[in-house]
Interface confidence: medium
């Protein structure tokens, strides 16, 4: 993946900066955690979970069992807001790819293990389609070691 300044599309970069991709991140994290729950296993040991509620038994987190609200309402709200944001990139497939890459980078150091990373990547690739948008044909979602901080 080339560095931003070599890619030349300044308009895409400023569009990305104006976009709020957080709902997409929240929606995807909720989705893969729901999928993991449906397989009936806890994907993390408590010490690994970057989103675990407080380890202090006297202090129950009000958002348990997962801080990513696993109820449908929260997820669909995030998805709706995410789709609204991605809609801004509908007419620029390269910029849509950049948006997906940004989401991947932002979450890369929060994904636990190769399996969860692959699952996140799979859901991320499907995201435009889920929103009724065209998915970019070729979009490299590999994150080099170091994630965001490699630049």
């Amino acid at each position: 993946r080339q560095q931003w300044e070599l890619q030349g599309d300044r308009r895409c970069q400023s569009q990305l900066e104006r976009a709020n991709l957080r709902p997409c991140e929240q929606h995807l994290m909720q989705k893969i955690q729901r999928d993991e729950d449906s397989y009936g296993r806890d994907p993390y040991s408590p010490s690994q979970d970057p989103y675990s509620p407080s380890q202090d038994p006297d202090r129950r987190d009000p958002y348990s069992p997962s801080p990513y609200d696993r109820r449908g309402a929260g997820s669909s709200q995030h998805q709706e807001r995410c789709c609204n944001e991605l809609n801004e990139f509908e007419n620029n497939q390269r910029c849509m790819c950049e948006a997906l890459q940004q989401i991947m980078e932002n979450q890369s150091d929060r994904l636990q293990g190769r399996q969860q990373e692959q699952q996140f990547k799979r859901e991320l690739r499907n995201l435009p389609q889920q929103c009724g948008l065209r998915a970019p044909q070729r979009c490299d979602l590999e994150v080099e070691s170091g994630g965001r901080d490699r630049y």
């Epitope: 560095q3 931003w4 300044e5 300044r10 970069q13 400023s14 990305l16 900066e17 104006r18 976009a19 991709l21 957080r22 929240q26 970057p50 989103y51 675990s52 801080p67 940004q102 980078e105 932002n106 929060r110 965001r148 901080d149 630049y151």
Partner: antibody, heavy 121, light 103 residues
């Protein structure tokens, strides 16, 4: 990876000052930059932020309309233009690099050493 | 609201600092450490992600409105002021700070 602030000095109430923050060691236009200040003996106060291209800017309510943040990516520099200065603007001003091009998603990981602004008549 | 505003502790103690918001901020909360005369240092981002080079005795947890920074075994170099900061929406406010002093 380094940030160096300059321009801090004595300013008059109602006057103007311009702070600069010069970066080195990273791809400058890839990251948002923030200004954070700390009044003597007080806590941290976020002041303003500018995204990687300069397309998006944000301000604290206390400085909105008086301060202006801008950047020159060709010179790896961010500026804070401070107008209509008040006594309560007296502080050490830090510039700080974000971890993403979009302002402040995941914290500020590189900080300058700070430059002191004193507003007094 | 960050609490306590200050605390006295001994080397080896477990220290817990809390940060509470008036509205939900998902996990967009960062923790910083600042020593006198120095710039702040990012310890934890997104409520629980430990930054590179930060000792594993520091940990963060929480979501929504309630967050904690825990130092499992206080070391001499940990005596400093700690700040939380929400980055859910602008203005990106900091907590008032918690000064950790030697008992």
């Amino acid at each position: 990876v380094q940030l160096v602030e300059s321009g801090g000095t004595l300013g008059q109430p109602g006057g103007s000052l311009r702070l600069s923050c010069t970066a080195s060691g990273f791809t400058f236009n890839r990251f948002a930059i923030n200004w954070v200040r700390q009044a003597p003996g007080k806590g941290l106060e976020w002041v303003a932020a500018i995204s990687g291209t300069g397309a998006v800017t944000y301000y604290a309510d206390s400085v909105e309309g008086r301060f202006s943040i801008s950047r020159e990516n060709s010179n790896n520099t961010v500026f804070l233009e401070m107008n209509n200065l008040r006594g309560e603007d007296t502080a050490v001003y830090f510039c700080a690099k974000d971890r993403t091009p979009v302002t402040n998603y995941y914290g500020m990981d590189v900080w300058g050493q700070g430059t002191t602004v004193t507003v007094s008549s | 609201t960050q609490s306590p505003s200050s605390l006295s502790a001994s080397v080896g103690d477990r220290v817990i600092i809390t940060c509470r918001g008036s509205q939900t901020i998902d996990n967009y909360l960062n923790w910083y450490q600042q020593k006198p005369g120095k710039a702040p240092r990012l310890l934890i981002s997104a409520a629980s992600s430990l930054q590179g080079g930060v000792p594993s005795r520091f940990s963060g947890s929480g979501y929504g409105t309630d967050f904690t920074l825990t130092i499992s075994s206080l070391q001499p170099e940990d005596f400093a002021t700690y700040y939380c900061q929400q980055t859910s929406s602008t203005p990106y406010t900091f907590g008032q700070g918690t000064k950790v002093e030697i008992k």
